[in-house]
Interface confidence: low
């Protein structure tokens, strides 16, 4: 049922009133305000912005707005001892040094506290040695190097291009390969779209531009020193040696001008195929080491960054629900940026600000949502999702009992082509129905629905006439809510055309050139895409907080469970002989999925027919819907990843950004042919199948008739 059935409001305060109140001009104004100076986590500037947002949210009409602080491990370059990489000759003389900073964009030359490019949480060190080019440093790239090409990275400095996977996975892979250091660079093949000028004349990355970013492998732990618990005043903190997820080798990022100087001298093996070659004018030889005349030259890294416990601040705003104040719908996005944050995060923060303003306007006119809405401005997302994770750790008991949904609100745009949505299957129908009611901002779709342009530009690979919705992975603040706590989650933003723009992320991601002007000049001059994203995010929050019956459809979970079971079965069937030898069967899992499908179907019928005016019955049915996501949580977590507890979805072990289905089974099967003890390996596959079977069956039973 739609939100207009909520009993606590006058008819005019419906979804349409909320959406009509959202204004593109306001989002533009807020974005400009949030991007004039850097707001790096742990700095005074970001604390001041937190206080400004607190003040404005109060003005907008929220019931309460609080700052919550935590003392977490952050990482910064040494201001007097800069990080760089050099080529040294046989005498140890530095004959080439990488740049110490990005040339600031016009108009920003006198801005102070622009942090130079660095890899956050890199240890200090000055390794030197031969270079090995490892492509994207993915698992498969190291397989190619080590297994096919017989190239040993042990004792070598590896150079990897950014893109395809989360940088932390690249560093982990390099460590496992025995590398002594990692150089990350942006190749024009991935960060320079053909036919577009580089900033400030276009949205492409200039040669001096560099992507900052953390290189942690936290696996959902939050603050590396206080895994599982909030980093508050009385927290026990681990020593640095026991900290979670810190890299053990120095890492540093560079732009493609500097990369050219390192890569042009590379010798050794040729690249195995064209997928290893970018578009610099260099050989893309793998190495190890430099060629011929340059073979006596080495590469040396000079990394002097420090990690220190630093105070961070979240802003938490509350709009109390009129009917079910103990049910929370959360809208959250981060506030901290690497530099100006023109896209990441402030294009998202500006949208959240306007959504808060619209909700506040309705509240000032006497309206309240049915359920409580919490708004969050997270700190230290760029340092490992720290603000959101610490807050969720502190409030975990409340959240697991009261959390209805979490909607993420980082960057509103990564392109201006079409909508992109990742969410729990429970929200599929909500998103479809909402986008059918919204107007498309796309050229050529005037007067058409957002659903129509989205479906045309990003069709579902499985169902014709429907748009693609992707799995949730990680790399953003929904992680703790979805992967750890099992709260139904979703995210939406405008994206690029993935067919024609093959580069990873947007070219200026995490660089100094990610400015207000980038957005205003090149991505969204009319701020119409920002407005659409505000309508989608805000509309989802409105429905989740205001619908009499929660807008979740458990039948969509049944459909994907069958799809994921088929997928993992097909992966396992690549080893038919071993499955026979070790008696590996997926029959139990398919049976559980069948049971889930039947029970979900019956539940949906009861949901349609029950007496909505009976508050006890209504609450009971809503609780079954709310707790369904929670039912997929295994309290023991995934193997070696205790904070990834969702049995159906987890971030890929090979790419934090990507979601993997039935991750426990998937990881048990991965590269199983190379395992030393096949009996043990297939035993683990069987164990994971049994866990998945139990979890699906148990989740199904939460939907059964209560008595």
């Amino acid at each position: 049922k739609s939100s207009s059935e909520a009993t606590n409001i006058t008819p005019k305060h419906n979804m349409k009133a909320f959406l009509d109140e959202l204004k593109a001009e306001n989002i533009k104004k807020f974005l400009h305000n949030f991007t004039q100076i850097p707001h790096l986590a742990g700095t005074e500037q970001n604390f001041q912005l937190a206080k400004q947002i607190q003040s404005q949210w109060k003005e907008f009409g929220l019931d309460s707005v609080e700052l919550t602080h935590y003392d977490v491990l952050l990482s910064y370059p040494n201001k007097t001892h800069p990080n760089y990489i050099s080529i040294i000759n046989e005498d140890g003389n530095e004959i080439f040094n990488t740049s110490l900073f990005e040339p600031p964009p016009a108009g920003y030359e006198n801005v102070s506290d622009i942090v130079p490019p660095f890899s956050a949480f890199s240890p200090q060190g000055m390794p030197e040695g031969d270079l090995v080019y490892v492509n994207y440093a993915r698992t498969e790239d190291f397989f190619k190097l080590e297994r096919d090409m017989k190239i040993n990275c042990s004792g070598k400095i590896v150079i990897a291009r950014y893109g395809k996977v989360f940088r932390g996975n690249k560093v982990k892979n390099a460590q496992l390969a025995g590398a002594t250091g990692v150089i990350l660079y942006s190749d024009p093949a991935d960060y320079f779209a053909p036919g577009v000028k580089s900033y400030p004349d276009g949205w492409n990355l200039p040669g001096g531009g560099v992507q900052r970013g953390n290189i942690l492998n936290l696996n959902g732990a939050g603050d590396p020193l206080t895994p599982g618990y909030p980093a508050n005043e009385y927290a026990y903190r681990r020593g640095i040696a026991e900290a979670v997820g810190l890299p053990s080798i120095p890492v540093h990022p560079i732009g493609y001008y500097d990369a050219q100087k390192l890569l042009e001298k590379m010798g050794g093996s040729a690249s195995p195929d064209s997928s290893w070659r970018g578009s610099l004018k260099v050989p893309y030889n793998v190495g190890p080491g430099f060629t011929g005349n340059f073979s006596t030259q080495k590469v040396k890294m000079h990394i002097h960054s420090t990690s220190e416990v630093t105070r961070i601040y979240n802003v938490i705003g509350t709009l109390r629900g009129a009917v079910e104040p103990d049910r929370y719908v959360i809208l959250g996005g981060h506030r901290d940026s690497w530099v100006f944050g023109g896209i990441d995060p402030q294009s998202g923060a500006a949208v959240v600000h306007e959504i808060v303003r619209s909700f506040g306007t309705l509240k000032k006119e006497g309206w309240r949502p049915r359920r409580t809405i919490l708004f969050a401005s997270w700190d230290a997302e760029e340092f490992g999702l720290l603000g959101s994770t610490e807050w969720a750790e502190e409030n975990s008991r409340l959240l697991q009992e009261r959390g209805v949904a979490y909607i993420n609100a980082d960057s509103s745009i990564e392109g201006n082509y079409t909508l992109r949505v990742d969410c729990t299957p429970l929200m599929y129908s909500l998103v479809y129905n909402l986008t059918k009611e919204l107007e498309s901002p796309d050229e050529g779709f005037e007067g058409k629905s957002l659903y129509e342009s989205w479906t045309k530009k990003s069709p579902s690979p499985e169902f014709s006439g429907m748009p693609r919705i992707s799995k949730l992975g990680s790399g953003n603040d929904f992680e703790v809510f979805f992967q750890r706590l099992g709260i139904a989650s979703g995210r939406a933003r405008y994206t690029k055309n993935w067919e024609t723009n093959k580069f990873s992320s947007y070219p200026l991601y995490h660089s100094v050139y990610e400015t207000y002007e980038l957005v205003e000049k090149f991505y969204d001059p009319m701020f119409k895409y920002h407005l659409t994203v505000a309508q989608v995010r805000g509309g989802m929050v409105f429905e989740l907080a205001n619908s009499v019956v929660l807008p979740f459809d458990c039948r969509d979970y049944a459909v994907v469970l069958r799809k994921y079971a088929d997928k993992i079965y097909n992966i396992s069937m690549k080893h038919p002989q071993e499955m026979k030898t070790y008696s590996v069967s997926f029959d139990s899992l398919f049976s559980a999925v069948k049971n889930f499908t039947e029970i979900a179907s019956k539940f949906s019928e009861r949901l349609r027919d029950f007496d909505k005016s009976n508050p006890i019955l209504l609450r009971m049915m809503n609780d079954q819907l709310m707790f369904l996501e929670r039912a997929f949580i295994d309290p023991l977590g995934l193997p070696d990843r205790p904070f990834y507890r969702h049995v159906i979805y987890a971030p890929s072990s090979h790419n934090k950004y990507a979601g993997e289905s039935f991750p426990g089974i998937y990881d048990a099967l991965f590269d199983i042919e190379s395992k030393v003890d096949p009996s043990q390996a297939w035993g683990e596959v069987k164990r994971q199948i049994s866990i998945a079977t139990f979890t699906v069956q148990a989740a199904a039973e939460t939907l059964s008739e209560v008595a």
Epitope: D148, M149, K150, I151, E264, G267, G268, S269, A270, S271, P272, D273, S274, R277, S279, L280, K281, V282, P283, Y284, N285, G287, P288, G289, T291, G292, S295
Partner: antibody, heavy 124, light 106 residues
């Protein structure tokens, strides 16, 4: 100037092994990869494998189990060893140097210098 | 493995003619296509690399073109010394593979 010269046994009995040496001059094996290619009588060229500057190798998948390529940088020699020869291994065997093309936008695997080849007959 | 197909195994032409030899790959090879000339005495020479780049010392009457899976070698103003067999080879993905060859006769 750049030269590559193959030397082999000429005649090999079936099921026996073949060893061919490629001796190079005018360049160093530390800077250039070497490929082996063969051509059966009246047929086309078949790529056998490559040894990279660092000593890593890649082989034609159909011959992988029988083929081994090694080298001695100091002697400027590359060695091809093939086991279990059959009559259809009768061919002219070439070694070829990979070109190093710098200063252009991409990198290309092309063999820009070839030996004159050595003829191998497998017969009892 | 990527299969390289030269559909024409032999080709007759007159001196001064322009001839074109074609080559098809079983999958997209991203322009990593080389052409070799093998003289009747067995000597092999690289003519063109990366679809259209002329190897130094090769006469400009040789040219190459193509993209994706379809490539061709053209010889304008055919000369007696061009009598040879021509092979295409993909340098995109290991293992590298050759086409079957096209024998050019006068």
């Amino acid at each position: 100037q750049v030269q590559l010269k193959e030397s082999g046994p000429g005649l090999v009995a079936p099921s026996q092994s073949l060893s061919i040496t490629c001796t190079v001059s005018g360049f160093s094996l530390t800077n250039y990869a070497i490929s082996w290619v063969r051509q059966p009588p009246g047929k086309g060229l078949e790529w056998l494998g490559v040894i990279w500057t660092g000593g890593g190798t890649h082989y034609n998948s159909a011959l992988k189990s029988r083929l081994s390529i090694s080298k001695d940088n100091s002697k400027s020699q590359v060695f091809l060893k093939m086991n279990s020869l059959q009559t259809d291994d009768t061919a002219r065997y070439y070694c070829a140097r990979k070109g190093n093309y710098y200063g252009s936008s991409l990198y290309y695997y092309a063999m820009n210098y070839w030996g004159q080849g050595t003829s191998v007959t497998v017969s009892s | 493995d990527i299969q390289m197909t030269q559909t024409t195994s032999s080709l007759s032409a007159s001196l001064g003619d322009r001839v074109t030899i074609s080559c098809r790959a079983s999958q997209d090879i991203s322009n990593y296509l080389n052409w070799y000339q093998q003289k009747p005495d067995g000597t092999v020479k690289l003519l063109i690399y990366y679809t259209s780049r002329l190897q130094s010392g090769v006469p400009s009457r040789f040219s190459g073109s193509g993209s994706g899976t379809d490539y061709s070698l053209s010889i304008s103003n055919l000369e007696q010394e061009d009598i040879a067999t021509y092979f295409c080879q993909q340098g995109d993905t290991l293992p590298y593979t050759f086409g079957g060859g096209t024998k050019l006769e006068i």
